[in-house]
């Protein structure tokens, strides 16, 4: 028999390898690339999926301003080094010992420096603003139907405590959700708000992690609703360390 | 029962390539990962990378990486560890194995030698 | 990479006595998402292939004799044999498969006193 006769894959995840390879001849799967063994029943970390995606083949208002040190993800993909609980590494570097520090959802915080930058903790990113702008539709969405539909989602799809979810704000075309998650706050067992965005980030791409299951199809009182703009706005528990030349690039 | 049979013992000289096979049996190839390993004389073992058969995901050591290539025909059930650019260093022990929590399967292992 | 460090490089026992073989890794091997530990241990005797003793840190290997455990969590393992006996004379290794690369100790040789 197969492994795919008996139905070894991993829901959560599609960027994996599953086999019956685990005690007692169980089905486990590992993440492409970091090859660490995967638990299929939530979300796996950003940094494995990071990594896998980089392995794989070839293949006045109520809307929020950003804080002053928010930040957002603008060096792109990078093959980033995952810590054995598939945290990221505070330091990562590239191939041309080029390092610099990430908070954790992976996002550059310091200048790049070179192999002697010190990154003494990963610091946690506990406030997360999603920036969403949706494309026209015959009328504004009804916020509280938007509200509910968006805190569903984040509840049944990415298994997020509604805790997490602070807010949602609606001033058309502009959504914003706001994912907030202290360090005191996420107990054991707890869907990380860095992992349910980036999920997010990629079913609104129409990127889905998810294995087998249909694309995102986010509909409010049946309107769809279809992004075409995401910002995604990262805050950190200490704020980030650039230089002046760079603030004022 | 599951086995792994090795090709046969390769003198190759200083340069050349070698081509390690290792047929395996009485499991499906296509479920299980296949990694390999290095034992150089009097030494510890190292792991070089590893094959999913089934869909040809592969995985190097950075340490082998330009040295190894880890092929795999799911016709034939059979592995392949190919080792190019030969220098002395590479005479070792090479072995196949079939990974996993409680896979202790290992192929008999073959030798190379390289020497001019 | 994850470095396994083993403790000691050589061991000598008397038949019938308990040996004790450590190794140490330099990052937890302990999945959070399973509870499992990624630690196997081998015996390897010369011009054989490593024999699976150990895996997921504790559970012995089918076919494997008791006197033979594994115990530890994290970074810090331990294999015991309870009461060696002469066939038991070989070298151990302890191994990491919890990331890439895969990783094994440097080995340590068992004899007998």
């Known amino acids: 028999h197969t492994a795919a006769q008996d139905n070894c894959t991993c829901p959560t995840n599609k960027m994996t390898v599953c086999s019956p390879d685990g005690p007692g001849g169980r089905c486990q799967c590992r993440a492409l690339g970091s090859g660490m063994a995967v638990d299929c029943s939530t979300l796996t970390s950003k940094c494995l999926l990071l990594k896998a995606r980089m392995s794989a083949p070839k293949n006045a208002r109520t809307l929020v301003r950003p804080s002053e040190h928010a930040l957002v993800d603008n060096d792109g993909l990078y093959d980033p080094d995952c810590d054995p609980e598939g945290r990221f590494k505070a330091r990562q570097c590239n191939q041309t010992s080029v390092c610099w520090c990430v908070n954790s959802v992976g996002v550059r915080r310091t200048d790049k420096g070179d192999l002697s930058l010190r990154c003494d903790e990963l610091v946690r990113t506990h406030h997360i603003l999603i920036d969403l702008r949706h494309r026209p539709t015959a009328g504004a969405f009804n916020h509280s139907d938007l509200d509910a539909e968006l805190r569903r989602l984040f509840r049944e799809r990415y298994r997020l405590h509604p805790k997490f979810v602070a807010a949602v704000h609606y001033e058309q075309p502009t959504i914003q959700i706001e994912l907030r998650q202290n360090t005191s706050q996420k107990a054991a067992g707890d869907v990380d708000i860095g992992d349910a965005a980036y999920y997010f980030e990629r079913d609104i791409k129409g990127e889905s992690l998810f294995q087998g299951r249909g694309g995102l199809d986010l509909r409010v009182r049946g309107e769809p609703l279809q992004v075409e703009r995401t910002l995604i706005y990262y805050l950190d528990e200490i704020p980030p360390k650039f230089s002046m030349k760079r603030l004022t690039a | 029962q599951v086995q792994l049979v090795q090709s046969g013992p390769e003198v190759k000289k200083p340069g050349a390539s070698v081509k390690v096979s290792c047929k395996a049996s009485g499991y499906t190839f296509t479920d299980y990962w296949l990694g390999w390993v290095r034992q150089a004389p009097g030494q510890g073992l190292e792991w070089m990378g590893n094959?999913?058969?089934?869909?040809?995901?592969?995985n190097y050591n950075e340490k082998f990486k330009g040295k190894v290539t880890i092929t795999a025909d799911t016709s034939t059930s059979t592995a392949y560890m190919e080792l190019s650019s030969l220098r002395s260093e590479d005479t070792a022990v090479y072995f196949c194995a079939r990974e996993g929590s409680n896979s202790g399967y290992w192929g008999q292992g073959t030798l190379v030698t390289v020497s001019s | 990479d994850i470095v396994m460090t083993q403790s000691p490089d050589s061991l000598a026992v008397s038949l019938g006595e308990r040996a004790t073989i450590n190794c140490k890794s330099s990052?937890?091997?302990?999945?959070?998402?399973?509870?499992?530990?990624?630690l196997a241990w081998y015996q390897q005797k010369p011009g054989q292939p490593p024999k699976l003793l150990i895996y997921?840190?504790?559970t012995r290997e089918s076919g494997v004799p008791d006197r033979f455990s594994g115990s530890g969590s994290g970074t810090d393992f331990t294999l015991t044999i309870s009461s060696l006996q002469a066939e038991d004379v070989a070298v151990y290794y302890c191994?990491?498969?919890?990331?890439?690369?895969?990783?094994f100790g440097q080995g340590t040789k068992l004899e007998i006193k």
């Open positions: 094959i999913f058969p089934g869909s040809a995901y592969i």
């Open positions: 997921g840190a504790s």
């Open positions: 191994q990491s498969d919890h990331i890439y690369p895969y990783t």
């Open positions: 990052q937890s091997l302990l999945n959070s998402g399973n509870q499992q530990n990624y």
